[in-house]
């Protein structure tokens, strides 16, 4: 009941707590001398369901049969209305509508660790909407039953606080949970188990790894476990991998040898434990141990390439380039590269250790046969050396690949294609595709990129170090024994019209014609490979269309003659540059008047 109910009573039959779908009778009755003053026949009793009027009656009492109440709590209030006055609250009642508890399902119990306590969980089933008390019972040996009640509103978990011990690991325990409310009760099916069934060991701790003689092949993992653990499972993976290697071990006693670890790799290790072969459950995984395996001497061989540049009649510059070994080949931190240069006929050799670079440049005589060997060294040893005989890579014209083309292939990729050389194509042992940013003046400091291709391939997709709007000089070499032939082409992955035109820096007169000289467009403004330059000219102050001369682009060219100008006429001249995407804006304008005689 609610309120003080001094003026009357509200009674509910059969009960304040009813089953969903049931009918209740609500009676509101006034106490003696509590009706309307002087007008007892005018007593008007009104029944409210929450704030909604549902019934009224003149007299000392009111009966109302109510059906269809929803799950939960519904508040009924009875009020008295007298003439010329506000309604007076008489009394009220709450009615609780719910259902009997369903049978709790999936009861399961677990004890975390040998020193832990037994805790059980279950599924309550649908909400009863009533206060429901859950009692968990655990029957064990010696005819004893523990009992614990849960008074939480939504109870589906209880920890008994009882520690089962392994003195009799095969002893049976039976758990059962009973739900009780005003409308009924229901018990779960019993769950029977032994100590071994429900004890979930604590995860292993204090994990360590040892490498005997700093060798990855002699590696032992150590850990600590609870005393009764029989089984362990180990999982480990390189830190940058998502896939685990799994190992199951029995009676490991806190140690296991690992035989398949890769050198110089950071691994993550975790261990789980179990008390019995087929009973019980695995522990959670332990905290991760992260450890780096020791180095081993490098495997594999360096990919080495070179460039020759003529200096003068007696000397040539050799630039050697090599690619880093992959992590799996380096098997450690590469401390230095060892480069050996040898003159094959005279036997002279020089060796140098290179640190921090993957290239080396030296000057050698143009005479003699030269060879180089390059290897990579870590703390444990060196890779097998890669040996190359230095030759003129483009000397054999008949070995030159034919019809070389370079086309954009998606974002930052260039597809290079070619045809085999005319000379017996089967003589080709491999192709090398080389590319570098095109820099007027042929800067040798520009990084060199290359890839090797099988002799039966006639295309290669180059993507390493390819940037948009940059022009690359691409060479395809066909190698056969100690001979080589090459062809070259310019290519870009993405292009647009150049951002500016060439800057004319001088116009000079030579025998009735002029020579125009210009500065190259800065590389960052070329926006791809230049195809042509255009030189425009028109008479000063003329509105006529300018004349133009189109010159194919060549890297080294920065001057061109024009011989169609009239003497003693002042002309305005300017230049533009073109890529496949279009023409640049004008470069600077220059005026010039040819002094020579007219023809």
């Amino acid at each position: 009941k609610i309120d003080a109910c001094k003026r009357g009573d509200v009674t509910v039959k059969p009960s304040h707590v009813i089953l969903l779908g049931s009918t209740v009778n609500i009676t509101c009755s006034l106490k003696p001398r509590q009706g309307c003053f002087h007008y007892s026949r005018r007593n008007k009793l009104i029944l409210y369901k929450f704030d909604r009027r549902i019934n009224f009656h003149h007299g000392h009492s009111l009966n109302s049969q109510v059906t269809g109440l929803p799950l939960g709590t519904t508040l009924f209030v009875c009020k008295l209305a007298c003439i010329n006055s506000d309604e007076i609250q008489i009394c009220g009642a709450e009615i609780f509508v719910g259902v009997a508890p369903e049978q709790p399902q999936n009861l399961s119990c677990i004890q975390k660790g040998e020193q832990g306590t037994v805790a059980c969980t279950w599924e309550r089933g649908r909400d009863t909407h009533l206060y429901t008390e859950y009692t968990l019972q655990l029957s064990g040996p010696k005819n004893l039953t523990w009992q614990k009640q849960c008074k939480d509103i939504y109870c589906d978990y209880l920890d008994f606080g009882i520690n089962l011990t392994p003195e009799s690991p095969e002893s049976n325990f039976t758990a059962k949970v009973t739900a009780v409310n005003s409308l009924g009760s229901s018990s779960s099916l019993p769950s029977t188990f032994t100590f071994l069934d429900i004890v979930r060991p604590l995860p292993p701790w204090d994990i360590r790894i040892k490498f005997q003689k700093a060798s990855v092949s002699r590696c032992t993992l150590y850990w600590r476990d609870e005393g009764l653990v029989l089984l362990n499972r180990l999982r480990y993976r390189p830190s940058n991998s998502r896939l685990w290697n799994m190992v199951n071990v029995t009676k490991a006693k806190g140690r296991h040898d690992l035989l398949d670890l890769k050198p110089f790799t950071e691994y993550e290790f975790q261990i789980s434990s179990k008390l019995h072969l087929y009973k019980g459950s695995w522990s959670d995984w332990s905290e991760s141990l992260r450890a780096q395996t020791p180095e081993e001497e490098p495997t594999g061989m360096l990919d080495v390439w070179y460039m020759k540049r003529h200096i003068d009649y007696s000397r040539q510059q050799i630039s050697l380039f090599w690619k880093n070994l992959s992590v799996s080949e380096a098997r450690g931190k590469i401390l230095h590269y060892q480069v050996t240069l040898q003159e094959l006929t005279g036997g002279k050799a020089m060796t140098q250790n290179i640190t921090g670079h993957t290239s080396w440049t030296t000057v050698i005589p143009r005479t003699g046969n030269w060879a180089v060997a390059v290897s990579a060294a870590n703390s444990k040893g060196s890779s097998l050396p890669t040996r190359i005989n230095i030759m003129n890579l483009c000397e054999a014209g008949l070995l030159a690949p034919r019809q070389v083309s370079a086309n954009s292939e998606g974002m930052d990729n260039i597809l290079v294609t070619w045809q085999p050389p005319r000379k017996d194509p089967s003589a080709v042992q491999e192709y090398v595709v080389e590319w570098r940013e095109l820099h007027p003046g042929g800067d040798t400091q520009v990084p060199l990129n290359w890839l090797r291709s099988r002799p039966y391939n006639v295309s290669a997709l180059i993507s390493e170090n390819i940037k948009s709007y940059i022009c690359y000089e691409i060479r395809v070499y066909a190698l056969s024994g100690d001979q080589g032939g090459c062809s070259s082409i310019l290519g870009n992955s993405k292009h647009k019209a150049p951002l500016s035109g060439p800057h004319i820096n001088a116009i000079t007169e030579e025998k009735g014609s002029i020579l125009i000289s210009w500065n190259s467009i800065p590389v960052q403004e070329q926006m791809g490979c230049l195809l042509h330059y255009r030189i425009y000219w028109k008479e000063r102050d003329s509105n006529s269309q300018p004349q133009l001369c189109e010159i194919p682009y060549r890297v080294s060219q920065n001057s061109h003659p024009i011989n169609s100008l009239q003497p003693r006429v002042t002309y305005v001249l300017w230049m533009t540059a073109l890529t496949a995407a279009g023409e640049s804006s004008h470069g600077n304008e220059r005026e010039f008047c040819l002094q020579g005689k007219a023809n």
């Epitope: 039953t145 523990w146 614990k148 011990t165």
Partner: nanobody, 126 residues
Framework: QVQLQESGGGLVQPGGSLRLSCVES????????MGWFRQAPGKEREIVAA?????????YQDSVKGRFTISRDNDAKNTVYLQMNSLKPEDTAVYYC??????????????????WGQGTQVTVSS
């Protein structure tokens, strides 16, 4: 020093009821699990029921489950009760009150009871 004093024993007919009480005189009642043990003539002492210090967990001998109820009053009286209904002749014994710091959780371990009362006789006979 903890002292336990039982009361409420007596002679009762089969099917009758008794309520045993045990008062702890020290000031440490709320830290102890409390229990009732019994010993019939010529038999070993056995646990009947016990209740945890916080009153949340109880334990019963299977032969009394559903007939006996253990409860405790931590607030004022420092008392543990054993309500015994539907008594049978085989319930005849001396009933002892006991206190232990981990009585209810370590029933399978020896010597887990710290203090004993003097005992009260319960006889069920027609």
């Amino acid at each position: 020093q903890v002292q336990l004093q039982e009361s409420g024993g007596g002679l009762v007919q089969p099917g009758g009821s008794l309520r045993l009480s045990c008062v702890e005189s020290g000031r440490t009642f709320t830290v102890y699990d409390m229990g009732w043990f019994r010993q019939a003539p010529g038999k070993e002492r056995e646990i009947v029921a016990a209740i945890s210090a916080d009153g949340a967990t109880s334990i019963y001998q299977d032969s009394v489950k559903g007939r006996f109820t253990i409860s405790r009053d931590n607030d004022a009286k420092n008392t543990v009760y054993l309500q015994m209904n539907s008594l049978k002749p085989e319930d005849t014994a001396v009933y002892y009150c006991a206190a232990g710091r981990s009585l209810i959780y370590n029933l399978y371990r020896a010597n887990n009871t710290d203090y004993w009362g003097q005992g009260t006789q319960v006889t069920v006979s027609s």
